[in-house]
């Protein structure tokens, strides 16, 4: 069975959009009007992995770029990064675990838990124009809830 993917944008629960900040980083900020075109379009691929009640394993690539969000240890801390891959080989059904996120979707709110580091989530800061990061707390100051907007292929 081939990998199924959809194209989408993500906004955090404060309606901040995600944009590129340099070649290997995303940041979250409020966009309006024509500036909305700056937001990154993700290719969300549905991959094989551990399924539980409301968790669906996905990989988050940047559409038409050979970049995927991945989770690695840096200075002993789980860290979110954009990783370059060989476009001939990605996406694939059996993505390496660092690329896999458990998408948790409840009432149109999404969370993305790292498969590599359980209980660490894709997060944004309350503050404007700050990097998207991997956070180890839910329900605190940092934002872990997102909404997804479908983008036609």
């Amino acid at each position: 069975a081939p990998v199924r993917s959809l194209n989408c944008t993500l906004r955090d629960s404060q309606q901040k959009s995600l944009v590129m900040s340099g070649p290997y980083e995303l940041k979250a900020l409020h966009l309006q009007g024509q500036d909305m075109e700056q937001q990154v379009v993700f290719s969300m691929s549905f991959v094989q992995g551990e399924e539980s009640n409301d968790k669906i394993p996905v990989a988050l690539g940047l559409k038409e770029k050979n970049l995927y969000l991945s989770c690695v240890l840096k200075d002993d801390k789980p860290t979110l990064q954009l990783e370059s891959v060989d476009p001939k080989n990605y996406p694939k059904k059996k993505m390496e675990k660092r690329f896999v996120f458990n998408k948790i979707e409840i009432n149109n709110k999404l969370e993305f838990e790292s498969a590599q580091f359980p209980n660490w989530y894709i997060s944004t800061s309350q503050a404007e124009n700050m990097p998207v990061f991997l956070g180890g707390t839910k329900g605190g100051q940092d934002i872990t809830d997102f909404t997804m907007q479908f983008v036609s292929s």
């Epitope: 069975a1 669906i56 059904k93 059996k94």
Partner: antibody
Framework: QVTLKESGPALVKPTQTLTLTCTFS??????????VSWIRQPSGKALEWLAH???????RYSPSLKSRLTISKDTSSNQVFLTITNVDPVDTATYYC??????????WGQGTLVSVSA | DIQMTQSPSSLSASVGDRVRITCRAS??????VAWYQQKPGKAPKLLIY???TLQSGVPSRFSGSGSGTDFTLTISSLQPEDFATYYC????????FGAGTKLELK
């Protein structure tokens, strides 16, 4: 937690159309990536995959039975349906529905036994 | 379609034995293979996916190996609750199952 339950007639006559219902809880078929399959098993025999429906209403069918099968869903009522036309005694089996984001099946219903006999 | 040929079709063993069940795909399926356990009157239970990844909650005495066309399910030390029928399944193409291996108490 995730539960699935199949229902349908216990007995149908040859040439009739069989309609099965899978009622589930603990997940939503509006969740992107989610899917439900129908799988059957004649008594004492192997499992046979029949059809799969995805959250976006994309459908897949077993090539050998495709012409007789229709899978559909009612997302709001958490149900998936399978119809099999022109049934035959060889369609006698326990019919299972199973949840899968991929095609390995982590969650199954208890199964419903359907006999096809005149 | 891809056939999954499972062997043996039945197997007698004792508690504590190490048991291997094999499955051969009619064409290359990479590691797109799952293994299930089924007890009489019950639905199958997923044990392993991706040929070798243990499903959450499954005891570590179960293991899977293989890629391409040849796959093995191993139970390292049989427990009384392990006597059941086991099925392999490929999902490289539309899903197909093996004919099953009935594991019985010797």
């Amino acid at each position: 937690q995730v539960t699935l339950k199949e229902s349908g007639p216990a007995l149908v006559k040859p040439t009739q159309t069989l309609t099965l219902t899978c009622t589930f809880s603990g997940f939503s078929l509006s969740t992107s990536g989610m899917g439900v399959s129908w799988i059957r098993q004649p008594s004492g025999k192997a499992l046979e995959w029949l059809a799969h429906i995805y959250w976006d209403d994309d459908k897949r069918y077993s090539p050998s039975l495709k012409s007789r099968l229709t899978i559909s869903k009612d997302t709001s009522s958490n149900q998936v349906f399978l119809t099999i036309t022109n049934v035959d005694p060889v369609d006698t089996a326990t019919y299972y529905c199973a949840r899968s984001a991929y095609y390995s099946f982590a969650y199954w219903g208890q199964g419903t036994l359907v006999s096809v006999s005149a | 379609d891809i056939q999954m040929t499972q062997s043996p079709s039945s197997l007698s063993a004792s508690v504590g034995d190490r048991v291997r069940i094999t499955c051969r795909a009619s064409q290359d399926v990479d590691t797109d293979v799952a293994w299930y356990q089924q007890k009489p009157g019950k639905a199958p239970k997923l044990l392993i996916y991706w040929a070798s990844t243990l499903q959450s909650g499954v005891p570590s005495r179960f293991s899977g190996s293989g890629s391409g066309t040849d796959f093995t399910l191993t139970i390292s030390s049989l427990q009384p609750e392990d006597f059941a029928t086991y099925y392999c399944q490929q999902y490289s193409s539309y899903p197909t199952f093996g004919a099953g291996t009935k594991l019985e108490l010797k």
